[in-house]
């Protein structure tokens, strides 16, 4: 018969014949022959291969270097790589998570719209009229101005995006 020019899925062409690829988690030891199947071997400890493959070496699991602020989010298996994330207060610089960035704080006049996570930074928003923030914080939202009326007081000093209103007693001396 004619030697094949293409092979089925999960096979590869070698020496004019189709051999089975090694399954995820295993590496190639020797190609198949007319008389033998492809020989595969499981990846060792701290190694992985995540596809059907003909690799002769498994990949090393990613190392989450604590000195870079990284920690293990998900331990790797023979079929998956380790997933790193950043320690509390920091987030990954990129999807690859090879280094970490300190979460930013929202300045006075801005509040936290979305709290940072291991993969995303703090999102700040300007405090709208009627709200304020007088601190630099990675957690605090804009606070509403105090309602003087509900306390039977009057506004003595108007609020800003950075300061609360100042309430005072009502002037009893009415003309």
């Amino acid at each position: 018969p004619e030697p094949p020019t293409a092979c089925r899925e999960k096979q590869y062409l070698i020496n004019s014949q189709c051999c089975s690829l090694c399954q995820p988690g295993q590496k190639l030891v020797s190609d198949c022959t007319e008389f033998t199947e492809t020989e595969c071997l499981p990846c060792g400890e701290s190694e992985f291969l995540d596809t059907w493959n003909r690799e002769t070496h498994c990949h090393q699991h990613k190392y989450c270097d604590p000195n870079l602020g990284l920690r293990v989010q998900q331990k790797g298996t023979s079929e998956t790589d380790t997933i790193c994330t950043c320690e509390e207060g920091w987030h990954c610089t990129s999807e690859a998570c090879e280094s970490c960035v300190l979460h930013r704080s929202c300045s006075p006049g801005f509040g936290v719209k979305q709290i940072a996570t291991g993969v995303s930074d703090t999102i700040c928003e300007p405090c709208p009229v009627g709200f304020f923030s007088n601190v630099s914080s990675a957690f605090e939202k804009c606070h509403p101005w105090t309602s003087c009326e509900t306390k039977d007081l009057v506004v003595q000093q108007a609020g800003t995006n950075k300061t609360d209103v100042v309430c005072g007693p009502q002037d009893r001396l009415r003309a």
Partner: antibody, heavy 116, light 112 residues
């Protein structure tokens, strides 16, 4: 080998702008933030801000917030720091520095002189 | 902003003798995650700064073990067990607990 190579010295007039570049090589540019630190003659170090080249997200020292713009060009692995409304006090050496274990790699520095 | 204060500002040392630089922060640099975000840099004459110690006490790669860093939440020390001629320059501490990142004024180490 990681390298950060900065653009050459600049002499600027008060009120003008300057844009300093920092070309990175030897590592994946988008995996680390790039910071800018300046040093006035005979003075200490002052942090200006950084860019995350992966997200193009900058963060600035409030002291410079209205005058500084930090950007990054992923295609050339280059970070930029532009400072506007220059005054004589902005005369300094400007450094780019990569954040990894610390500021573990620094550019050679770019001298910016502001003089009329 | 967190204020970093170094002392002394000038430190003349005889080669072979020990040296100690102090750095104080206006706020504790010990994060709730257990790490202390204090860093030391050396700027040799005519050069860019280089990092020496990160996270208060971890020595950077290639830095001689005569250097050491220690401290608590607000008080930190950089020690050189035996000063050599190549150690001259300005030493800076820096905090990376919160923005803006801030440096100490610097300590100039010179050989007597």
């Amino acid at each position: 080998e990681v390298q950060l190579v900065q653009s050459g010295a600049e002499v600027k007039k008060p009120g003008s702008s300057v844009k300093v570049s920092c070309k990175a090589s030897g590592y994946t540019f988008t995996s680390y933030t790039m910071h800018w630190v300046r040093q006035a003659p005979g003075q200490g170090l002052e942090w200006m801000g950084y860019i995350n080249p992966s997200s193009d997200y900058p963060n600035y020292n409030q002291k410079f917030k209205d005058r500084v713009t930090i950007t990054a060009d992923k295609s050339t692995s280059t970070a930029y720091m532009e400072l506007s409304s220059l005054r004589s006090e902005d005369t300094a050496v400007y450094y780019c520095a990569r954040w990894g274990y610390s500021f573990d790699y620094w550019g050679q520095g770019t001298t910016v002189t502001v003089s009329s | 902003d967190i204020v970093m204060t170094q002392s002394p500002l000038s430190l003349p040392v005889t080669p072979g003798e020990p040296a100690s630089i102090s750095c104080r922060s206006s706020k504790s640099l010990l994060h709730s995650n257990g790490n202390t975000y204090l860093y030391w840099f050396l700027q040799k004459p005519g050069q860019s700064p280089q990092y020496l110690i990160y996270r208060m006490s971890t020595l950077a790669s290639g830095v001689p073990d005569r250097f050491s860093g220690s401290g608590s939440g607000t008080d930190f020390t950089l020690k050189i067990s035996r000063v050599e001629a190549e150690d001259v320059g300005v030493y800076y501490c820096m905090q990376h607990l919160e923005y803006p990142l801030t440096f100490g004024q610097g300590t100039k180490l010179e050989i007597k």
